[in-house]
């Protein structure tokens, strides 16, 4: 049962690595660490170390999304950590690649029905208190491994089994073909190149780009929707401000994705949320009087 | 050892609204998924919904869509329900349950129940 | 919803005595299934998951078995202490849903 692989995993990541010869790359200082007779030491990275229980978070989140959508309960959660593990641990943290997480991918294999994908931009709040209300729309983060990793960080080490709970590479700092942002840029890729019909996005209104082409959404997620599957884009830029009443759909940046998208042969629709706090209250009661009016 | 500890009995006026707590302990809140379970007297029982503490996801079976709010507060492992427009036909027990994770998705662990009284 | 149909909805046997409670499903459940016993003024307690496994602390005497839309919970040698309604549940899809329950007594 779960307790046992815990039980099982605390064993080896804190008496596992010893065994095994270290060796380093990069420019990241050194740190000792352990308290055997040869001393040992660990790449110090500038981004954050691991999130705190990191493989109990991983396994108990598989077992929890499979006991609340019945339909992935085929999945084996034992084996879904460790294509997870085998993705990043005893590699460099710097050189991780897509085919890492092939694996892991794999096993996570869940389709979307046609026009019920919705992408999000530094917006994502907003985006997953919408498909709590609108069940049959689906972020990334909806999906199991989205879900398995949301909101989380991990790396290991080159040629030992310990996860790096000190710090991790850092995307700008470091290295951008580091665990995490490996993980999100193929779990992305396949998700949008999955999608069919009209896929949805959400845009931030208050950033001074609204679309960002260095974003995960405008580097990944524009360039792998299929022209063949997905017949339309349909932006929600959501105004932040009560009194903003102007047509951010005529931004340059919505401009510019307007033409990557089209030039892809997509259509591309944009609407204004004026109200986001209306918008959602309308999508869980769309019978109310006030929502016959725009939001 | 895991423990659901609910709050005690309520009685709640035609109209009004009551909310009941589970005290999770023994195990980390959020690695679990949190049910809630209606007993009406000598009646069977009838699944209201879940929540994932984690997340404050939530579902509900239709019937209790409009009756029944689910919330979770992380810092202080607790979840609630709070029951709104109590009606006679809310007068009942109400359950906090969860799985083991090794017990299927059967609900291995309850909380002792609280009596909602519905009268004027 | 998937209905689960309990039967019979009381019975009455003696010490010793073996009793079978059947439990069917409206649709095929796969071995998506629980029992629980519930003593007055008590919660419900899990006795077996995936429709034959014992819970634990659960006694041997407790057994299930069945899969799809057919199950039933026996119990040998009859005790005291199962003085008890039990339920069943499909844990296949949402909503979950119980059986109405079976009060055992003794004769």
């Known amino acids: 049962g779960l307790n046992d692989i815990f039980e099982a995993q605390k064993i080896e990541w804190h008496e596992g690595s010893h065994h095994h010869h270290h060796h380093h790359h990069g420019s990241g200082s050194l740190v000792p660490r352990g308290s055997g007779s040869l001393p040992r030491w660990r790449q110090q990275w500038s981004g954050s170390g691991t999130t705190s229980r990191f493989p109990e978070t991983v396994l108990a989140r598989c077992v929890k999304y499979t006991e609340v959508h019945p339909e992935m309960r085929h999945v084996d959660c034992q084996s879904v950590w460790d294509a997870f593990k085998g993705a990043f641990i005893s590699k460099y943290p710097c050189n991780i690649t897509e085919e890492d997480y092939q694996p892991l991918v794999k096993l996570g294999t869940q389709t979307v029905p046609c026009n019920k994908t919705l992408l999000w931009s530094r917006i994502k709040d907003l985006a997953h208190q919408f498909t709590q209300v609108q069940r049959d729309m689906f972020t990334l983060e909806d999906m199991l491994l989205g879900y398995l990793a949301d909101d989380l960080t991990w790396c290991g080490e080159f040629n030992t089994f310990e996860i790096n709970y000190q710090s991790c590479p850092d995307w700008r700092k470091d290295c951008s073909n580091n665990p995490v942002s490996v993980f999100w840029k193929t779990v992305s890729r396949r998700f949008a190149e999955t999608a069919c019909g009209v896929v949805h996005v959400m845009l931030n209104g208050s950033r001074s780009k609204i679309f960002d082409k260095n974003s995960t959404f405008g580097s990944v997620e524009v360039h792998n929707l299929q022209p063949e599957k997905v017949q339309a884009l349909e932006a929600w830029v959501i105004h932040g401000g009560r009194e903003d009443s102007r047509d951010l759909c005529q931004d340059p940046t919505i401009k510019e994705l307007e033409s990557i998208i089209s030039k892809r042969n997509i259509r591309f629709f944009c609407k204004n949320i004026y109200r986001p706090d209306k918008f959602l209250q309308c999508v869980k009661n769309p019978e109310d009087s006030s929502c016959l009016s725009g939001i | 050892e895991v423990q659901l500890q609910q709050s005690g009995p309520e009685v709640g006026r035609p109209g009004s609204s009551v909310k009941i707590s589970c005290k999770a302990s023994g195990y980390t809140f959020t690695d679990y998924i949190m049910h809630w379970v209606k007993q009406s007297p000598g009646q069977g029982l009838e699944w209201i919904g879940w929540?994932?503490?984690?997340?404050?996801?939530?579902d509900y079976a239709e019937k209790f869509k409009k009756k029944a709010t689910l919330t979770a507060d992380t810092s202080s492992s607790t979840a609630y329900i709070q029951l709104s427009s109590l009606a006679s036909e809310d007068t009942a027990t109400y359950f906090c349950?969860?799985?083991?994770?090794?017990?299927?998705?059967?609900?291995?662990?309850w909380g002792q129940g609280t009596l909602v009284t519905v009268s004027s | 919803d998937i209905q689960m149909t309990q039967s019979p909805a009381s019975l009455s046997a003696s010490l010793g005595e073996t009793v079978t409670i059947e439990c069917r499903a409206s649709?095929?459940?796969?071995?998506?299934l629980a029992w629980y016993q519930q003593k007055p003024g008590n919660s419900p307690q899990l006795l077996i998951y995936d429709a034959n496994s014992l819970a634990d602390g659960v006694p041997s005497r407790f057994s299930a078995s069945g899969s799809g839309t057919q199950f039933s919970l026996k119990i040998n040698s009859l005790r005291s202490e199962d003085v008890a309604s039990y339920f069943c549940?499909?844990?296949?899809?949402?909503?979950?849903?119980f059986g109405a329950g079976t009060k055992l007594e003794l004769k």
């Open positions: 349950a969860r799985s083991a994770h090794t017990t299927g998705f059967g609900f291995a662990y």
């Open positions: 929540i994932d503490p984690e997340y404050g996801r939530t």
């Open positions: 549940q499909q844990y296949n899809n949402y909503p979950y849903t």
């Open positions: 649709e095929d459940i796969y071995s998506n």
